[in-house]
Interface confidence: low
């Protein structure tokens, strides 16, 4: 008979014959022959293969490198890779999350518009007129100036984007 030119699903063509692929979690040791089936071996610890394959080497699990701010979110198995995520207080520097950096703080005069997440940095906004922030923080929003009037006081010193207003007593001498 003519040798096959294509093989069924989960098979591969070698030396004019169809051999079974190795299942996920196993690597190829030797191809099948006329007399023997494909020989496969389980991946070692810290290795994986996630598809039906004819790979002679398993892939190393991804290393969640603490120097890059990464930690293990989900431990890998013989069939799945390790999933990394950023340490708390850090966020990914790219969509692939191959490294992380510390959430930035908003400087005095700026408040937090959006608190950082594991995948996005802190978003800061300038404190508008009537609001201030006197701290460098990754959490604090701009605070409204104190309302002197509601306390029956007057403004003694105007507020800025970095300082609150200073209230003082009404001038008793005025009519």
């Amino acid at each position: 008979p003519e040798p096959p030119t294509a093989c069924r699903e989960k098979q591969y063509l070698i030396n004019s014959q169809c051999c079974s692929l190795c299942q996920p979690g196993q690597k190829l040791v030797s191809d099948c022959t006329e007399f023997t089936e494909t020989e496969c071996l389980p991946c070692g610890e810290s290795e994986f293969l996630d598809t039906w394959n004819r790979e002679t080497h398993c892939h190393q699990h991804k290393y969640c490198d603490p120097n890059l701010g990464l930690r293990v979110q989900q431990k890998g198995t013989s069939e799945t890779d390790t999933i990394c995520t950023c340490e708390e207080g850090w966020h990914c520097t790219s969509e692939a999350c191959e490294s992380c950096v510390l959430h930035r703080s908003c400087s005095p005069g700026f408040g937090v518009k959006q608190i950082a997440t594991g995948v996005s940095d802190t978003i800061c906004e300038p404190c508008p007129v009537g609001f201030f922030s006197n701290v460098s923080s990754a959490f604090e929003k701009c605070h409204p100036w104190t309302s002197c009037e509601t306390k029956d006081l007057v403004v003694q010193q105007a507020g800025t984007n970095k300082t609150d207003v200073v209230c003082g007593p009404q001038d008793r001498l005025r009519a």
Epitope: D65, N67, L68, R71, G89, V101
Partner: antibody
């Protein structure tokens, strides 16, 4: 003002042990920094020894430092310690405490503490 | 692990002039830009000047400029002043699963 200060250096005999302490002032470990130890032999370059993630306590060691050096932290005291054992003359150096907030860049350093290993 | 090779010491610079120090890595640094530069004066700890190859650290004068990518990096100091006399170190982070951190051997800058 953010500062780091090392202590615990001094003269120690070969095969001896020493524990160095780094005190952080002006910032909290809950701010999620890496705290590291770097050393510098007299007249030589810089060498990273070990780091600890101040928030979770996860550690990293240079391969040559594994086994003889142990890094740990105390969040309540805002300190990082480096325990050194089986010291040799080659460990004579100034030991610096340094902080990293990402990109493997050290933005804050202590003045250093000198460790001399000699008989 | 990567080996970082710096311009041999000492390098001479004239006040008001420009000086460049090179740093060559035996392997590409992480993301092609995870390289930093430090200034160290005798009896003092290193001071961060540049990180991510070209980003100026807080409080560092813009006379200091970092450039380069992959394996070749340069620190350039323009309008040199006497206070720039120091030893300069590059530091790179190469890759996971290795002793990825490496410091260069240092380059001494002498200001005349």
């Amino acid at each position: 003002q953010q500062q780091l200060e090392e202590s615990g250096g001094g003269l120690v005999k070969p095969e001896g042990s020493l524990t160095l302490t780094c005190k952080a002032n002006g910032f909290s470990f809950s701010a999620n920094y890496y705290m590291c130890w770097v050393r510098q032999a007299p007249g030589k370059g810089l060498e990273l020894i070990a780091c600890i993630y101040a928030s979770s306590g996860s550690t990293w060691y240079a391969s040559w430092a594994k086994g003889r050096f142990t890094i740990s932290k105390s969040t309540s005291l805002n300190t990082v310690t480096l325990q050194m054992t089986s010291l040799t003359v080659a460990d004579t150096a100034t030991y610096f405490c340094a902080r990293s907030g990402g990109y493997a860049a050290y933005d804050l350093w202590g003045p250093g503490t000198l460790v001399t290993v000699s008989s | 692990a990567a080996v970082l090779t710096q311009t041999p010491s000492p390098v001479s610079a004239a006040v008001g002039g420009t000086v460049s120090i090179s740093c060559q890595s035996s392997k590409s640094v992480y993301n092609n830009n995870w390289l930093s530069w430090y200034q160290q004066k005798p009896g003092q700890p290193p001071k961060l000047l540049i990180y991510r190859a070209s980003t100026l650290a807080s409080g560092v004068p813009s006379r200091f400029r970092g450039s380069g990518s992959g394996t070749e990096f340069t620190l350039t100091i323009s309008d040199v002043v006497c206070d720039d006399a120091a030893t300069y170190y590059c530091a790179g982070y190469e890759s996971v699963n290795t002793d990825g951190h490496a410091f260069g051997g240092g380059t001494e800058v002498v200001v005349k």
